[in-house]
């Protein structure tokens, strides 16, 4: 399936403080799950993968082709 | 407390250059996405940029794509706005933000007047 | 781009009342859809996000519902300090803001 990269963001992007636990944002990702599609202004964000919003940061996130790494799957796996 | 504080604003003639900054701290600068946002006097707010947290990405306004470059230097929790080409529909208050989408806090803002 | 048309653009209200102000894109954003409130010579403030989750330290009298293209943002009950200028923004196209809607006080 490919590699699952994350921003290294926390829940701290919707919360007042950035080790903050949410509450709010942890209601929203049980209610809605914890990715959503992308927003259309980060379709060329992954460059070897696919995109997935986090929907507790509201933030894009890449799951990563096989072979490729990085924030934006921009990387090739040299050990792969 | 998260801190973000605009410099580099200013009087600047039509066609002429400006940086802003926007100096960051009170969160761990590095994990988040930043933005640009400005609002012209007595008007609206209107997204400019953003980058996300390790600046390899970049998303631009048609309104100032190919004019504005957005960069960040995380080691000194920085953010930039370069302004070039500017016009007289740049005058703004211009604030940096925290995130790429949404925007939870925001600077106090620089006036940036381009006029001649 | 998207166009987030907000309305009333402008509206009286008297503390203690329900009110209510609408925004509509242009296109469905899903449930891409921010609230913000700002005041004179203020920075604006996240009220919600997602179209109805509250930020964080915002007070529960406001609410924000709706999805696709039609949203709204509830006060319940108007305080004195809620009396200000109201953004909704989206953000599945690029980033776009509404033209505002400013309370002022009856």
């Known amino acids: 399936d490919g590699n699952s990269t994350r921003s290294p963001e926390t829940n701290g992007l919707l919360c007042g403080d950035p080790e903050e636990n949410c509450a709010a944002t942890t209601t929203q990702s049980k209610r809605k799950g914890h990715f959503s599609r992308c927003p259309k202004q980060y379709k060329h964000y992954c460059i070897k993968g696919r995109c997935r919003f986090v929907v507790a940061e509201q933030t894009p996130s890449c799951v990563c082709d096989e072979g490729y790494i990085g924030a934006r799957c921009e990387r090739v796996d040299l050990f792969y | 407390q998260v801190q973000l504080l605009e410099s580099g604003g200013g009087l600047v003639q039509p066609g002429g250059s400006l940086r802003l900054s926007c100096a960051a701290s009170?969160?761990?600068?590095?994990?988040?996405?930043i933005s640009w946002v400005r609002q012209a006097p007595g008007k609206g707010l209107e997204w400019v940029s953003h980058?996300?947290?390790?600046?390899?990405?970049?998303l631009y306004a048609d309104s100032v794509k190919g004019r504005f470059t957005i960069s960040r230097d995380n080691s000194k929790n920085t953010l930039y706005l370069q302004m070039n080409s500017l016009r007289a529909e740049d005058t703004a208050v211009y604030y940096c933000?925290?995130?790429?989408?949404?925007?939870?806090?925001w600077g106090q803002g620089t006036l940036v007047t381009v006029s001649s | 781009d998207i166009q987030m048309t907000q309305s009333p653009s402008s509206l009286s209200a008297s503390v203690g009342d329900r009110v209510t102000i609408t925004c509509r894109a242009s296109?469905?954003?899903?449930?891409?859809l921010g609230w913000y409130q700002q005041k004179p010579g203020k920075a604006p403030k996240l009220l919600i996000y997602?179209?109805?989750s509250l930020q964080s330290g915002v007070p529960s009298r406001f609410s924000g519902s709706g999805s696709g293209t039609d949203f709204t943002l509830t006060i319940s009950s108007l305080q004195p300090e809620d009396f200000a200028t109201y953004y909704c923004?989206?953000?599945?196209?690029?980033?776009?803001f509404g033209q505002g809607t400013k309370v002022e006080i009856k």
């Open positions: 933000a925290r995130g790429g989408s949404l925007f939870d806090y």
């Open positions: 009170g969160f761990t600068f590095s994990r988040y996405w």
């Open positions: 980058i996300n947290y390790e600046g390899t990405w970049t």
């Open positions: 296109q469905g954003i899903i449930s891409y």
């Open positions: 997602a179209a109805s």
């Open positions: 923004q989206q953000y599945d196209a690029l980033n776009t």
